[in-house]
Interface confidence: medium
Amino acid sequence: ERLCHPCPWEWTFFQGNCYFMSNSQRNWHDSITACKEVGAQLVVIKSAEEQNFLQLQSSRSNRFTWMGLSDLNQEGTWQWVDGSPLLPSFKQYWNRGEPNNVGEEDCAEFSGNGWNDDKCNLAKFWICKKSAASCSRDEEQFLSPAPATPNPPPA
């Protein structure tokens, strides 16, 4: 039986998007490239639900993980890799005392229960994001059954 899998193998589905949590580490710029190579983008967070989901993935694996957010263009002005600004309501995700820009920390990572700014040249895990497949009859993602990745409960 052919089943619909909206995401590629080893990607996780959540609210209409697919996420890839890397198992290797790269610096922030190379993480952007890695995501582009698989037709995705270093993760840009659009909602509180998405943030909670991703934060939980990161904290469960106890990994420092790059997201697509930096203030490289202008110090103190945080911007996503798709060009959108950091929404006011997202400021609450920074860990206590962050962002602190100690030693030119211009790229954002998932760290513990929130976000931290760190040096962009450091190697960390990363998360890619792309839209889920629609699963029409001719969609490539009709694959042999893959293990379903359940959505975790809200944080």
Partner: antibody
Framework: QVTLRESGPALVKPTQTLTLTCTFS??????????VSWIRQPPGKALEWLAL???????YYSTSLKTRLTISKDTSKNQVVLTMTNMDPVDTATYYC??????????????WGRGTLVTVSS | DIQMTQSPSTLSASVGDRVTITCRAS??????LAWYQQKPGKAPKLLIY???SLESGVPSRFSGSGSGTEFTLTISSLQPDDFATYYC????????FGQGTKVEIK
């Protein structure tokens, strides 16, 4: 010990501008993640958020009142000032200032001042 | 703007009762919700943040639950000091309070 104290006139005439000062101690508004808000409560009614100022000087205003409100801070004096123009009797309320703590649990209000009652009347 | 609706507006209860207050958001706010207690002539006091986290120093008989658009504040065994007005507040997008629930003596 963290404290916040509101001060300002108890009585304001209609059309006048209200200026309220929140003086705080025990924390700094230059610490990342810390914010101070103004919230009001008309007698016998619910709480209404008015404005918030962040450690980095970002400012946010209630959609319905933003044309009348201005919030500012003096970090060296540990003060946040709210001005509200064109006062009307319906603006009679207790005005509170409150702190938002730093941290990744969100921008709720963990500490409040005692409030100051402002009456608008001619 | 996100609207917050509390129910009931008034609740009559006795000491020892289990009390539940509901708060609904007009759109999903994930778990960015706080609960406050206010007594007459006093400033509000934070009880719960992030929907279910108990503020330091708040008695454990208070608990919060919910996610998305529906939330509850529960007082497991009402004490004399608990008769007050309770407000929910969302902080997912700017800041909005519910209209309050007054818990009075039956």
């Amino acid at each position: 010990q963290v404290t916040l104290r509101e001060s300002g006139p108890a009585l304001v005439k209609p059309t006048q501008t209200l200026t309220l000062t929140c003086t705080f101690s025990g924390f700094s508004l230059s610490t990342s993640g810390v914010s101070v808000s103004w919230i009001r409560q008309p007698p016998g009614k619910a709480l209404e958020w008015l404005a918030l100022i962040d450690w980095d000087d970002d400012k946010y205003y209630s959609t319905s009142l933003k044309t009348r409100l201005t919030i500012s801070k003096d970090t060296s004096k540990n003060q946040v000032v709210l001005t509200m123009t064109n006062m009307d009797p319906v603006d009679t309320a207790t005005y509170y200032c409150a702190r938002t703590p730093s941290g990744s649990y969100g921008r709720y209000f963990d500490l409040w001042g005692r409030g100051t009652l402002v009456t608008v009347s001619s | 703007d996100i609207q917050m609706t509390q129910s009931p507006s008034t609740l009559s209860a006795s000491v020892g009762d289990r009390v539940t207050i509901t708060c609904r958001a007009s759109q999903s706010i994930s778990n960015w919700l706080a609960w406050y207690q206010q007594k007459p002539g006093k400033a509000p006091k934070l009880l719960i943040y992030k929907a279910s986290s108990l503020e330091s120093g708040v008695p454990s008989r208070f608990s919060g639950s919910g996610s998305g658009t529906e939330f509850t504040l529960t007082i497991s065994s009402l004490q004399p000091d608990d008769f007050a007005t309770y407000y929910c507040q969302q902080y997912n997008s700017y800041w909005t309070f519910g209209q309050g629930t007054k818990v009075e003596i039956k």
